[in-house]
Interface confidence: low
């Protein structure tokens, strides 16, 4: 596959992953519980996210409450907020870096420098995926531990919410996309014949850039 094709595919995956990460960050479904309140007949589901919690009645009526005070939040939620928002912002930066290093743009003159910019974009997306993976796995670990903790009452027991699964899918896309961008940049520097023909006559020579290790795929 040509380096331009790798770039385009990688960028598309990263953009979809970025959208998924924003969705996961905003959704209140990081933790979900469904239990029957003994005082009322209707079953209710409670959702908890990074920014708000919602109660959904079996009738379909949903009531959400945004967390009032940052100081009142648990360390886990505060850290998850910081890391997830950090990952979203890093992906935003990575987008501009990737576009600057893309073969179809003229922000940076073609050559080793442009390939290095493209590689940096790929690495930033990989870092973004790893950064987002930390709060997702941390939250999941807390949910699982508390579920099996005998001293946590049923009304406080939560299960893994949809936002976590969306987040994991998003991080996978970001990391695969980032990997493809890195591969594209590497192909561009080591195999000039596989890259887009360009109008500029800047010299192209292979540079020592890091190969993408498949073992990094999560």
């Amino acid at each position: 596959m040509g380096s331009a094709a790798l770039e385009i595919l990688g960028l598309v995956l990263c953009l979809v992953g970025w959208g998924g990460l924003i969705l996961a960050c905003g959704l209140p479904m990081w933790q979900v519980t469904a239990f029957l309140d003994h005082n009322i007949v209707t079953a209710q589901t409670t959702w908890k996210g990074l920014w708000m919690s919602c109660v959904v009645q079996s009738t379909g009526h949903m009531q959400c409450k945004v967390y009032d005070s940052v100081l009142a939040l648990s360390t886990e939620v505060q850290a998850a907020r910081a890391l997830t928002v950090g990952a979203v912002l890093l992906a935003f930066v990575a987008l501009f870096v990737t576009l600057a290093g893309a073969q179809c743009t003229t922000c940076v003159a073609p050559g080793p420098a442009k390939a290095r910019v493209a590689l940096t974009g790929g690495v930033l997306y990989l870092l973004c995926g790893l950064l987002a993976l930390v709060p997702l796995c941390w939250f999941a670990n807390i949910v699982v531990r508390e579920f099996y903790d005998p001293s946590v009452p049923v009304s406080q027991k939560y299960e893994l919410g949809a936002a976590l699964y969306i987040g994991w899918a998003a991080t996978a896309l970001l990391m695969v996309g980032g990997g493809l961008l890195c591969c594209g940049a590497w192909v561009c520097t080591s195999r000039p014949d596989l890259s887009f023909p360009v109008k500029y006559s800047a010299p192209r020579r292979p540079t020592a850039t890091g190969d993408y290790d498949k073992k990094n795929y999560v």
């Epitope: 903790d149 001293s151 009452p153 049923v154 299960e159 893994l160």
Partner: antibody, heavy 117, light 112 residues
């Protein structure tokens, strides 16, 4: 081999106190929640209390709440049950049990507590 | 509290037959998040302490013979003992390990 050995049972008058001990061996004691489960003569099983790994969180059945206290000493690999204000309905065989994932996978041989005047 | 109802309370059996013990909970013991049912089965022989046979409704504890089979989901569960042997004569209890307070069924006594 996992072993749980209870001790401290006996005959006690209503209103008095008694402390049960359970010596654990054959496994990493601090890696498990522990519990006490009792069985009244010719009756079924009743969960009494549970305690987390380091002893910072405890939980009790309604019938013993505010009267019984579960505790543990991880250095001695021993589980305790301090029973106060004992009643005749507390007469039972008390089992110490290992408590992973909220079920009871290993039980001691049990110790008999008789509350009678 | 979750109420566990076992049936029958006692059962006259003979060696070699297949025995079925039922357990019903007042509330679902199924976790949609983990796709697991939080029910355990215990065997208590006369003069002995209980022994765990099955947890998570169908997972056999190591060392438990494969003639003991746990099944069911939600609120209805079954312990099946295939080709009953003399050493299987005991009282069998079900227990919900979904929520505190952990509750047991009243037991099913197998007798000759």
């Amino acid at each position: 081999e996992v072993q749980l050995v209870e001790s401290g049972g006996g005959l006690v008058q209503p209103g008095r106190s008694l402390k049960l001990s359970c010596a654990a061996s054959g496994f990493t004691f601090s890696d498990y929640f522990m519990a006490w489960v009792r069985q009244a003569p010719k009756k079924g099983l009743e969960w009494v209390a549970s305690i987390n790994y380091e002893g910072s969180r405890t939980y009790y059945g309604d019938s013993v709440k505010d009267r019984f206290t579960i505790s543990r000493d991880n250095t001695k690999t021993t589980l305790y049950l301090q029973m106060t204000s004992l009643r005749s309905e507390d007469t039972a065989t008390y089992y110490c049990a290992r408590h992973p994932r909220r079920y009871f996978d290993f039980w001691g041989q049990g110790v008999m507590v008789t509350v009678s005047s | 509290d979750i109420v566990m109802t076992q049936s029958p309370s006692s059962l006259a059996v003979s060696a070699g037959e297949t025995v079925t013990i039922n357990c019903k909970s007042s509330r679902s013991l199924f976790s949609s998040g983990y796709q697991e049912n939080y029910l355990a089965w215990y065997q208590q022989k006369p003069g002995q302490s209980p022994k765990m046979l099955i947890y998570l409704a169908s997972t056999r504890e190591s060392g438990v013979p494969d003639r003991f089979i746990g099944s069911g989901s939600g609120t209805d569960f079954t312990l099946t003992i295939n080709t009953l042997q003399a050493e299987d004569l005991a009282i069998y209890y079900c227990q919900q390990h979904y929520d505190i307070p952990y509750t047991f069924g009243a037991g099913t006594k197998l007798e000759l």
